[in-house]
């Protein structure tokens, strides 16, 4: 179990079986019925309670520090309560399941699903060790999903799963500078399924973005826009129902 690894080890990759350097273990916990690892009810995210239940506490099925569930993660749409108990990451670097704008309307009041397209403000830009988490469900017969890390009118990182490009499923990553798209980076591993829930996590590293989907490392994308502190917004669009979009430091 990853609980034996220190946060430092998890981040540096030293002495752990997780070479991508993600915090904690990824996808090695037996799944609940129909769910992701550690799910507490069918189709749920790790450690997620039914909507609206258990505000601010870890719901049944989410033990502290469970792989795939950040410590004491609240159900999406509720404000987080105190951190979970022993077994969670050290409090100095403890990820919360929600950072800014957790499943809220534009003024910070608790709300239901977010309206897509949705913009997550990043007023201080992005910095290394920042973890952005997006929870949602792919719509049936989906065509595309897009995440756009925006620097003014530029797109520093465009993450674009395409469900049917010439009868193939592919993820395209790119950067747009001065209205011009650069060289595409394509990834054929495609972890999204129409009609199914997903969790996308983007970890900002000094020289690249790391992306994991459903607790499995997917890809990394080297920074083409170097001024990370100027990446001030994350645009989320496409054929999804969006549950929450949030960030924290790890």
């Amino acid at each position: 179990m990853a609980d034996n690894f220190s946060l430092h080890d998890a981040l540096s990759g030293s002495g752990n079986p997780n070479p991508q350097g993600w915090p904690g273990a990824w996808g090695n916990q037996p799944a609940g019925a129909g769910g992701y690892p550690g799910a507490s009810y069918p189709g749920a995210y790790p450690g997620q309670a039914p909507p609206g239940a258990y505000p601010g506490q870890a719901p049944p099925g989410a033990y502290p520090g469970a792989p795939g569930a950040y410590p004491g993660a609240p159900a999406p749409g509720v404000y987080p309560g105190p951190p979970s108990g022993p077994g969670a990451y050290p409090s100095s670097g403890q990820p919360s399941a929600t950072g800014a704008y957790p499943a809220t309307g534009p003024y910070g009041a608790p709300a239901g699903p977010l309206i897509v397209p949705y913009n997550l403000p990043l007023p201080g830009g992005v910095v290394p060790r920042m973890l952005i988490t997006i929870l949602g469900t792919v719509k049936p017969n989906a065509n595309r999903i897009a995440l756009d890390f925006q620097r003014g009118n530029d797109v520093a990182f465009h993450f674009n799963p395409r469900f049917n490009e010439n009868n193939r499923r592919v993820i395209v990553c790119n950067t747009k500078l001065d209205n011009n798209w650069g060289r595409e980076e394509r990834q054929s591993v495609f972890p999204f399924e129409s009609g199914k829930p997903f969790k996308i996590q983007v970890l900002v590293e000094p020289d690249h973005f790391k992306v994991a989907v459903n607790d499995a490392h997917l890809l990394q994308y080297n920074h083409r826009v170097k001024k990370l502190n100027e990446i001030s917004k994350l645009g989320i669009s496409g054929d999804i129902d969006l549950t929450s979009a949030s960030y924290t430091m790890i």
């Epitope: 601010g56 404000y79 987080p80 309560g81 105190p82 951190p83 403890q94 990820p95 919360s96 929600t98 950072g99 800014a100 704008y101 957790p102 809220t104 534009p106 003024y107 910070g108 913009n119 403000p121 007023p123 201080g124 830009g125 910095v127 925006q150 620097r151 003014g152 009118n153 001024k227 502190n229 100027e230 001030s232 917004k233 924290t248 430091m249």
Partner: antibody, heavy 114, light 107 residues
Framework: QVQLQQSGPQLVRPGASVKISCKAS????????MHWVKQRPGQGLEWIGM????????RLNQKFKDKATLTVDKSSSTAYMQLSSPTSEDSIVYYC???????WGQGTTLTVSS | DIAMTQSHKFMSTSVGDRVSITCKAS??????VAWYQQKPGQSPKLLIY???TRHTGVPDRFTGSGSGTDYTLTISSVQAEDLALYYC?????????FGGGTKLEIK
């Protein structure tokens, strides 16, 4: 270096709207949110809202939704806050601040008086 | 809204002393906390963000710490120029909210 130059002190009659400006220089104006914060003399700070100059998306504190309107002029790298129907309660200092916010303007003192 | 409480409105100290200013959030703000210094007649200056990251040009006698709901700004050796008002702010969720401020005074 980063500079946020706010408009000077303003005297306004109750009920007449007023617009405060904040001219930015020394950084990429469209790459950072611009915040507005109010402060009563000898009292604490209160966040009014913020605007993304690249597309004018705003996030307002619900408390100020009928009071403040945030706009920008990209061509002059200037942010504006318009206050509607000011009362004596609005006689305070208003700051603009960029980004985190990490740099602040010098403040604009508003006096509402008949 | 998230309330940020600075329990000490005033703190007395002497030059050279170590002082800690505390701030408590009404809910877990996941280290999304900044600290500002404001001197009379001046605008606030950012000292610390993300609870512990020092802003450019801030002397290393200023350090921030904390997690969950409890955050602290520590000045390891107070200088005369540090006498000011100090505010914490959460940037976890809108509306961003500030603490009421702590005024650092000389004994």
């Amino acid at each position: 270096q980063v500079q946020l130059q706010q408009s000077g002190p303003q005297l306004v009659r109750p009920g007449a709207s007023v617009k405060i400006s904040c001219k930015a220089s020394g950084y990429s104006f469209t790459s950072y949110w611009m915040h507005w914060v109010k402060q009563r003399p000898g009292q604490g700070l209160e966040w009014i809202g913020m605007i993304d100059p690249s597309d004018s998306e705003t996030r307002l504190n619900q408390k100020f939704k009928d009071k403040a309107t945030l706009t920008v002029d990209k061509s002059s790298s200037t942010a504006y806050m318009q206050l509607s129907s000011p009362t004596s309660e609005d006689s305070i200092v208003y700051y603009c601040a960029k980004g985190r916010p990490d740099y602040w303007g010098q403040g604009t003192t508003l006096t509402v008086s008949s | 809204d998230i309330a940020m409480t600075q329990s000490h409105k005033f703190m007395s100290t002497s030059v050279g002393d170590r002082v800690s200013i505390t701030c408590k959030a009404s809910q877990d703000v996941s280290t999304a906390v900044a600290w500002y210094q404001q001197k009379p007649g001046q605008s606030p200056k950012l000292l610390i963000y993300w609870a512990s990251t020092r802003h450019t040009g801030v002397p290393d006698r200023f350090t921030g710490s904390g997690s969950g709901t409890d955050y602290t700004l520590t000045i390891s050796s107070v200088q005369a120029e540090d006498l000011a008002l100090y505010y914490c702010q959460q940037h976890y969720n809108t509306p961003y909210t500030f603490g009421g401020g702590t005024k650092l005074e000389i004994k």
